[in-house]
């Protein structure tokens, strides 16, 4: 019986050009995590395998950094990065748990630009 639950950061927003940490946490189970897949819709970003380490999809290798932990850091964000991200936890003996994160990448705010160039 699968007793675990995935906790995620839920809906998050970040600024264009910045970075964000995608983080999931599996709780309420003693199952062993054997692999975590990070996916955006049907596109693989990375796999973290307990035995082997990380496989970063070549399409993302310049913008994705492993960690912290089983999480994933997405860098140099663009508006096209807006969307759903999934952490898929493969566990033994429970099976597969999936968590969802929605990321919205925002244009730099006018207020922030205004603050930077404020006349004293």
């Amino acid at each position: 019986m699968m007793t675990g639950t995935i906790e995620t950061t839920g809906n998050i927003s970040a600024e264009k050009g910045g970075s964000i940490i995608l983080q999931c946490h599996l709780s309420s189970t003693t199952a062993q995590v054997t692999q975590v897949n990070w996916e955006q819709q049907d596109q693989l970003l990375a796999i973290c395998n307990a035995d082997l380490g990380w496989h970063i999809s070549p399409s993302f290798k310049d913008r994705v950094a492993p960690g912290p932990g089983l999480g994933l850091t997405l860098q140099s964000l663009t508006v096209n990065d807006t969307g759903e991200y999934f952490c898929i936890y493969h566990t033994y003996p429970d099976g597969t748990y999936t968590g969802r994160i929605f990321l919205e990448v925002l244009e730099s705010s006018v207020a922030e630009h205004g603050a930077r160039f404020q006349i004293p």
């Epitope: 054997t34 692999q35 796999i47 395998n49 035995d51 496989h55 070549p58 492993p66």
Partner: antibody
């Protein structure tokens, strides 16, 4: 020398579930540096990768089939299995299992070629 | 996904002739390109891994070259037993993909 052998029903009815097993002999399925694949080939057509499983249960499936595919592993029997549900005539094919090797180092890993293949088993979807 | 485009689809060749089969990837795959030979009613047999490394037992007339997106399998001095379909395969990126195949027929 490692050998792979596919087994399962040769005929499956539309809308039912196709179930195949690949038995590994001459080596352990639990080796850290291998991943275990299913590939299919419709009559007169090319090869289509279905997905893989690692001995500890980690999988990745072809997005084109993901909603219908489950690959599982039984290390005690040195076997891994494929289930494909809601089959149609388009799933008629020769199904192969194959061993892929993995390169790892420095905290990263990479997928290598598939160096050992089963002989294949023909599955026909028909009522 | 990475699309592998093979050409030609079909080639009819006389014995002892040289055969060149090309495989083009839709994006760079480095050197993660492999070749397989499949004869009728048989499973694919590994020929060459990582562009140019021959598997043991593969005749020296088979060779591979290329990098990035463009790759070539060459059969020098074709023999009758080489009649088969040849597939390229990339392991750089998931999902793993295969080329559409090139059928080589002996004239």
């Amino acid at each position: 020398q490692v050998q792979l052998q596919e087994s399962g029903p040769g005929l499956v009815k539309p809308s039912e579930t196709l179930s195949l097993t690949c038995t590994v002999s001459g080596g352990s399925i639990s080796s850290v540096y291998f991943y275990w694949n299913w590939i299919r080939q419709p009559p007169g057509k090319g090869l289509e990768w279905i997905g893989y499983i690692y001995y500890s249960g980690g999988t990745y499936y072809n997005p084109s089939l993901r909603s219908r595919v489950t690959i599982s592993v039984d290390t005690s029997k040195n076997q891994f299995s494929l289930k494909l549900n809601s089959v149609t005539a388009a799933d008629t094919a020769v199904y192969y299992c194959a061993r892929g090797s993995i390169a790892a180092g420095g905290g990263y890993f990479y997928y290598n070629d598939m160096d050992v293949w089963g002989q294949g088993t023909t599955v026909t979807v028909s009522s | 996904e990475i699309v592998l485009t093979q050409s030609p689809d079909f080639q009819s060749v006389t014995p002892k002739e040289k055969v060149a089969i090309t495989c083009r990837a839709s994006q760079s795959i480095g050197s993660s390109l492999h070749w397989y030979q499949q004869k009728p009613d048989q499973s694919p047999k590994p020929l060459i891994k990582y562009v140019s490394q021959s598997f043991s037992g593969v005749p020296s007339r088979f060779s591979g070259s290329g990098s990035g997106t463009d790759f070539t399998l060459t059969i020098n001095s074709l023999e009758a037993e080489d009649a088969a379909t040849y597939y390229c395969h990339q392991s750089s990126s998931l999902p793993l993909t295969f080329g559409g195949g090139t059928k080589v027929e002996i004239k």
